[in-house]
């Protein structure tokens, strides 16, 4: 969490941002809140990015003001217009690009004063893994697949019964570049699995950590997946 304070002749206002991550090709949100004002027409929101000449986005007098917007953000940014009045200056970013990563500043002017806070935005790709029994294999085998990751993640297998065991000798992981030549499909195979055990396939890079669990018994197969972003620090 980053909390910034204004430093101007007028009073300073508190602006709060949260570091976050964007999944390339999907929509993202850069979070920013501020002390609200009672009049929308008195609020100015400016989003800036380190190293970028033009503005990322400007919202003033209740509407977008995009004459100074940088080309790289054209057509891709919006604030939550109906929530500005309650202090939400968060930015929607359409179709997140790898190059959107960097340091952003959320700068606010209201009738009470000015304030700003920085935000670190990471970009990459992350997706939920799915673990299945590979019936085509000669021995009892599990296959863990996740369609989109970037940067290249690590894959670790674990089991409930053999806690702390190292499965690297009995697993094989491959990374296949997807058609857009950035993200990769992750496939990991675990051999010699036993029934009545829960196995977990854990995929992690510096942006996200995802786990796919599978429990195989004589009578049924239970699956569960979970994904967690790693860098949600507030400022």
């Amino acid at each position: 969490l980053i909390i910034g304070f204004g430093i101007s002749g007028r009073h300073s206002i508190t602006v709060t941002t949260v570091a976050s991550a964007g999944n390339i090709g999907e929509d993202g949100i850069l979070s920013c809140t501020f002390e609200p004002d009672i009049k929308l027409s008195d609020i100015v929101i400016q989003w800036l990015k380190e190293g970028v000449l033009g503005l990322v986005h400007e919202f003033k007098e209740g509407k977008d003001e995009l004459s100074e917007q940088d080309e790289m953000f054209r057509g891709r940014t919006a604030v939550f217009a109906d929530q500005v009045i309650v202090g939400n200056a968060s930015l929607r970013l359409k179709n997140v690009q790898l190059t959107d990563a960097g340091t952003y500043k959320c700068y606010i002017i209201t009738s009470k004063g000015k304030g700003n806070a920085n935000l670190e935005y990471k970009t990459g790709a992350f997706s939920m893994p799915e673990v299945n029994v590979d019936y085509n294999a000669s021995s009892e085998t599990l296959r863990c697949e996740a369609p989109r990751w970037f940067p290249q993640p690590t894959v670790v297998w674990a089991s409930q019964v053999d806690q702390g065991a190292n499965f690297s000798e009995v697993s094989n992981t491959s990374f296949e570049l997807n058609s857009e030549n950035v993200t990769m499909k992750v496939v990991s195979v675990l051999y010699n699995v036993t029934i009545n055990n829960t196995y977990s396939c854990m995929i992690e890079n510096d942006i996200a950590k995802a786990t796919g669990d599978i429990k195989v018994t004589e009578s049924e197969i239970k699956r569960r997946s979970h994904l967690q972003l790693l860098n949600s620090k507030a400022s």
Epitope: R74, R76, F80, K94
Partner: antibody
Framework: QVQLQQSGAELMKPGASVKMSCKAT????????IEWVKQRPGHGLEWIGE????????TYNAKFKVKATFTADTSSNTAYMQLSSLTSEDSAVYFC??????????????WGQGTSLTVSS | QAVVTQESALTTSPGDTVTLTCRSS?????????ANWVQEKPDHLFTGLIG???NRVPGVPARFSGSLIGDKAALTITGAQTEDEAMYFC?????????FGGGTKLE
């Protein structure tokens, strides 16, 4: 006023490729997304994908990722969609539409008149 | 992929109020689905009506309004007119793709 003018009907052979166009007039072409939509009788509307003119930014419906390719030429304010390896399943009317993404709303507003594609041997 | 469901047909009379709905197979429709409503008249004449759940496209008559009703997106025509007889499609955004409903024929 805003207009999206699409190219004329096409009759193509299976296996061929076709490139259809959507010429935009009356607005700043590079500030709006161009969406491509497929309409087949009994199948409703299917979103193919979108392009932001003046950038290389595109989004494709997974189903059409191999089939469709979008390009846009900002000098002529024209968006293009190429469909490859045509089959009878590709016979349809294809529309381009303008999509506005902004703080106050997100909407499809203007649509082209459609390009009819027939794939037949 | 999500499935978006609309009433296949509705009948109304001039002056009446009619509501068309749009349901998502993935759960409740929210403002993050940016619900859009599009009208199709004969000869493939499409016009955008509503975007972002409840914002009228500029130039669209005030009798058209969008909202969320329960877990669905809705298009309400207050005081329907004969020229409103058409096909109405909703479209929902799912983070990186649009899905259209099957359309409602309004008679």
């Amino acid at each position: 006023q805003v207009q999206l003018q699409q190219s004329g009907a096409e009759l193509m052979k299976p296996g061929a490729s076709v490139k259809m166009s959507c010429k935009a007039t009356g607005y700043t072409f590079s500030s709006y997304w161009i969406e491509w939509v497929k309409q087949r009788p009994g199948h409703g509307l299917e979103w193919i994908g979108e392009i932001l003119p003046g950038t290389s930014i595109t989004t494709y419906n997974a189903k059409f990722k191999v089939k469709a390719t979008f390009t846009a030429d900002t000098s002529s304010n024209t968006a293009y969609m190429q469909l490859s390896s045509l089959t009878s399943e590709d016979s349809a009317v294809y529309f381009c539409a303008r999509y506005y993404f902004g703080s106050s709303s997100f909407y499809f507003d203007y649509w082209g008149q459609g390009t009819s594609l027939t794939v037949s041997s | 992929q999500a499935v978006v469901t609309q009433e296949s047909a509705l009948t109304t009379s001039p002056g009446d109020t009619v509501t068309l709905t749009c349901r998502s197979s993935t759960g409740a429709v929210t403002t993050s689905n940016y619900a859009n409503w599009v009208q199709e008249k004969p000869d493939h004449l499409f016009t955008g009506l509503i975007g972002g759940t409840n914002n009228r496209v500029p130039g669209v008559p005030a009798r058209f309004s969008g909202s969320l009703i329960g877990d669905k997106a809705a298009l309400t025509i207050t005081g329907a007119q004969t020229e409103d007889e058409a096909m109405y499609f909703c479209a929902l955004w799912y983070n990186n793709h649009w899905v259209f409903g099957g359309g409602t024929k309004l008679e």
